[in-house]
Interface confidence: low
């Protein structure tokens, strides 16, 4: 999957673009918006009817080194009595993000962009019932 | 990928931080991913905290299209299909990394950007504040 060239006619390549070898692109990994603040509802992972846990994976040859993954705690959903209701399903909600992968080839190193699918949290859904004829 | 020679002696690069700027292959390694959440699952309709998906497009960004979730209701859908306001539908937000063309309009020069997206909604028990 290649990054598409911008096709709009008003996007003429400016003179100020840095020279880049063919088949590659220049990537500055200093992050824009590094310190933006997030206002997510408090403790939703434990207050949800489809609660989840978090784990962190760590890989020094990936940038960022850490990726946070959520895992649904239950197959069913938690009802008003605090019991698991298996007539409903807890399902993961996923989102893609980009990482940079460092690869070693002998004494050389190369960099590759990679899409990673992250499980962000869980939601409670009505199951799809398949009726057998 | 684009190969960069390492120093003589080939030290253990596990101890090296990533350089501030890297040259990366234009091909993105991403088997199997489907960027349209409407096609990948119908959870947004079947959830007890359903959401609508809004298309956010920006040609200066990769991916240029990102889908944003907006919860349909303040409450959650109960077993009768009605909205129960004793529960709350809340967005699940995630910070993700995207590529921003820098300088603007350049075809092969990017910078990582952190953006906040609402990915879906989940049904939660509300936090009740008791007034003394």
């Amino acid at each position: 999957r290649k990054i598409p060239k911008v096709g709009h006619t008003f996007f003429q390549k400016p003179e100020s673009c840095p020279p880049v070898p063919g088949g590659s692109m220049k990537l500055d990994i200093g992050i824009i918006n590094e310190n933006q603040r997030v206002s997510m509802s408090r403790n939703i992972e434990s207050r949800s009817t489809s609660p989840w846990n978090y784990t962190v994976t760590w890989d020094p040859n990936r940038y960022p080194s850490e990726v946070v993954q959520a895992q649904c705690r239950n197959l069913g959903c938690i009802n008003a009595q605090g019991k698991e209701d298996i007539s409903m399903n807890s399902v993961p909600i996923q989102q893609e993000t980009l990482v940079v992968r460092r690869k070693h080839q002998g004494c050389s190193v190369s960099f590759q962009l990679e899409k990673v699918l992250v499980t962000v949290g869980c939601t409670c859904v009505t199951p799809v019932i398949h009726h057998v004829q | 990928g684009i190969t960069i020679p390492r120093n003589p002696g080939c030290p253990n690069s596990e101890d090296k931080n990533f350089p501030r700027t890297v040259m990366v292959n234009l091909n993105i390694h991403n088997r199997n991913t489907n960027t349209n959440p409407k096609r990948s699952s119908d959870y947004y309709n079947r959830s007890t905290s359903p959401w609508n998906l809004h298309r956010n497009e920006d040609p200066e960004r990769y991916p240029s299209v990102i889908w944003e979730a907006k919860c349909r209701h303040l409450g959650c859908i109960n077993a009768d299909g009605n909205v129960d306001y004793h529960m709350n539908s809340v967005p699940i937000q995630q910070e993700i990394l995207v590529l921003r063309r820098e300088p603007p309009h350049c075809p092969n020069s990017f910078r990582l950007e952190k953006i906040l997206v609402s990915v879906g909604c989940t049904c939660v028990t509300p936090i009740v504040h008791h007034v003394a």
């Epitope: 590094e34 434990s46 784990t55 946070v68 | 910070e95």
Partner: nanobody, 119 residues
Framework: EVQLVESGGGKVQAGDSLTLSCVAS???????AAWFRQAPGKDRRELVV?????????YTADSVKGRFTASRVNTKNTVYLQMNSLKPEDTAVYYC????????????WGQGTQVTVSS
């Protein structure tokens, strides 16, 4: 602006225990708190332990499993690193960090506290 201050470092013998503390002032710890360390001569910080706001440990480095654990007391804005059965290879500067989502970087870092383990 949140400031993180570590304390509790020092010189100990192999096999000893030590507890490091990290206090957040000017705000609170975000979702995640973590302890990193940077060994002498290394230019990379190693993630040692990561802890979620609920107190659940979300990551422990293989090299410290069964010896190190983290805890946090949110009401005191403090995170702890309990280090048992210390080894000379645990010698490093230990840093405390805080993040909303570590997958896109830690927002705040402490200045570090030195731990030296002699055999």
């Amino acid at each position: 602006e949140v400031q993180l201050v570590e304390s509790g470092g020092g010189k100990v013998q192999a096999g000893d225990s030590l507890t490091l503390s990290c206090v957040a002032s000017g705000g609170t710890f975000s979702n995640y708190a973590a302890w990193f360390r940077q060994a002498p001569g290394k230019d990379r910080r190693e993630l040692v332990v990561s802890i979620f706001r609920t107190g659940s440990i979300t990551y422990t480095a293989d090299s410290v499993k069964g010896r190190f654990t983290a805890s946090r007391v949110n009401t005191k804005n403090t995170v702890y690193l309990q280090m048992n059965s210390l080894k000379p290879e645990d010698t490093a500067v230990y840093y405390c960090a805080s993040a909303y989502n570590p997958g896109v970087g830690y927002d705040y870092w402490g200045q570090g506290t030195q731990v030296t383990v002699s055999s």
